[in-house]
């Protein structure tokens, strides 16, 4: 009785269970009752990452420098190339097909998380007691200067964009 289902790492073809090709190899010819499945290794620029019956290997991803991409991990016969973005850029999507410059955090906002090749800068508003007076992709909110520790007094209050202005204490005679 011909099989209707096959074991793991097998496939059903013309009432016959054949072994799938292992990762890194493509199918050349189905098995027969007498012959094992014929598989061939993928060429240097190609890969297959699963047990398969593909007759063509997939091309490795190309990390196009014109799109700001560079190779993070070279592909093998079993894995695709992993691209990342050049310094100052990050991927536009999870598949990292192109790059855009990191955004800067505007005055009044500080960097919560510095951008990587795959994620953009995360900004946060400077809370009371902190400020940022620059547009930056690296700088966090800085604390207001503590006038007291310098034996000074606050002459002008700080904001989320400006530091406090300290001045000498008025000495009453």
């Amino acid at each position: 009785e011909p099989p209707t289902a096959c074991r793991e790492k097998q496939y059903l073809i013309n009432s016959q269970c054949c072994s799938l090709c292992q990762p890194g190899q493509k199918l050349v010819s189905d098995c027969t009752e007498f012959t094992e499945t014929e598989c061939l290794p993928c060429s240097e620029s190609e890969f297959l990452d699963t047990w398969n019956r593909e007759t063509r290997c997939h091309q490795h991803k190309y990390c196009d420098p014109n799109l700001g991409l560079q190779v993070q991990q070279k592909g093998t016969s079993e894995t695709d190339t992993i691209c990342t973005c050049e310094e100052g850029l990050h991927c536009t999507s999870e598949s990292c097909e192109s790059c855009v410059p990191h955004r800067s955090c505007l005055p009044g906002f500080g960097v919560k998380q510095i951008a990587t090749g795959v994620s953009d800068t995360i900004c946060e508003p400077c809370p009371v007691g902190f400020f940022s007076n620059v547009s930056s992709a690296f700088e966090k909110c800085r604390p207001w200067t503590s006038c007291e520790t310098k034996d000074l007094v606050v002459q002008q209050a700080g904001t989320n964009k400006t530091d406090v202005v300290c001045g000498p204490q008025d000495r009453q005679r």
Epitope: C31, T32, E33, F34, E36, E38
Partner: antibody, heavy 117, light 109 residues
């Protein structure tokens, strides 16, 4: 390159025995089933026998069943056909051929067996 | 046993002409497991077509196979001098035995 080379043919008297060999090279012999096919002088092709890649399954044409035995030695990359009780009608060129789901894709050049008294 | 009948027995044609060879099976050939072979005098057969219509590696595209079930055809669109030979069909779906047709000889007219 992929190649099959038969040997062992010759002239033999009726009732006697002969063993044919088929040496394989250029491919993973132990992964393929193998066939013997023969061709009598001036006639068409006749399938004789098949053996599975590991030597477990064997099938024969009715005309040779009980007289011929197909076997293989994967360590030597060689296929065999033991022919006993030979008859005049076994006179033919004997070819070995590789089994695939695409048919017999590789053939040897053949070896001539003549059964004559 | 599947019996394969090839026709015609001999085909006399000139180079450049189209050749149409027929192979008829006594019962349906499962999965179209039918192959065509070419054999020249003193040589081993050579696989041309498998699965009724797929060309084997290195076979020129003037050779084509068609058909399914019980009726199969090998067509040579424009005969070249090297195409004059004997052609055999073979079924490899239902065995034993693997059966061959009786052959068609394509000769120069």
């Amino acid at each position: 390159q992929v190649q099959l080379v038969e040997s062992g043919g010759g002239v033999v008297q009726p009732g006697r025995s002969l063993r044919l060999s088929c040496a394989a090279s250029g491919f993973t012999f132990g992964s393929y089933g193998m066939h013997w096919v023969r061709q009598a002088p001036g006639k068409g092709l006749e399938w004789v026998a098949v053996i599975s890649y590991e030597g477990v399954k064997k099938y024969y044409a009715d005309s040779v069943k009980g007289r011929f035995t197909i076997s293989r030695d994967n360590s030597k990359n060689t296929l065999y056909l033991q022919m006993n009780s030979l008859r005049a009608e076994d006179t033919a060129v004997y070819y070995c051929a590789r089994d695939t789901s695409r048919g017999h894709d590789i053939w040897g050049q053949g070896t001539m067996v003549t059964v004559s008294s | 046993e599947i019996v394969l009948t090839q026709s015609p027995g001999t085909l006399s044609l000139s180079p450049g002409e189209r050749a149409t060879l027929s192979c008829r099976a006594s019962q349906s050939v499962s999965y179209d497991y039918l192959a065509w072979y070419q054999q020249k005098p003193g040589q081993a057969p050579r696989l041309l077509i498998y699965g009724a219509s797929a060309r084997a590696n290195g076979i020129p595209d003037r050779f084509s196979g068609s058909g399914s079930g019980t009726d199969f055809t090998l067509t040579i669109s424009r005969l070249e001098p090297e195409d004059f030979a004997v052609y055999y069909c073979q079924q490899y779906a239902d065995y034993p035995p693997f059966t061959f047709g009786g052959g068609t000889k394509v000769e120069i007219k």
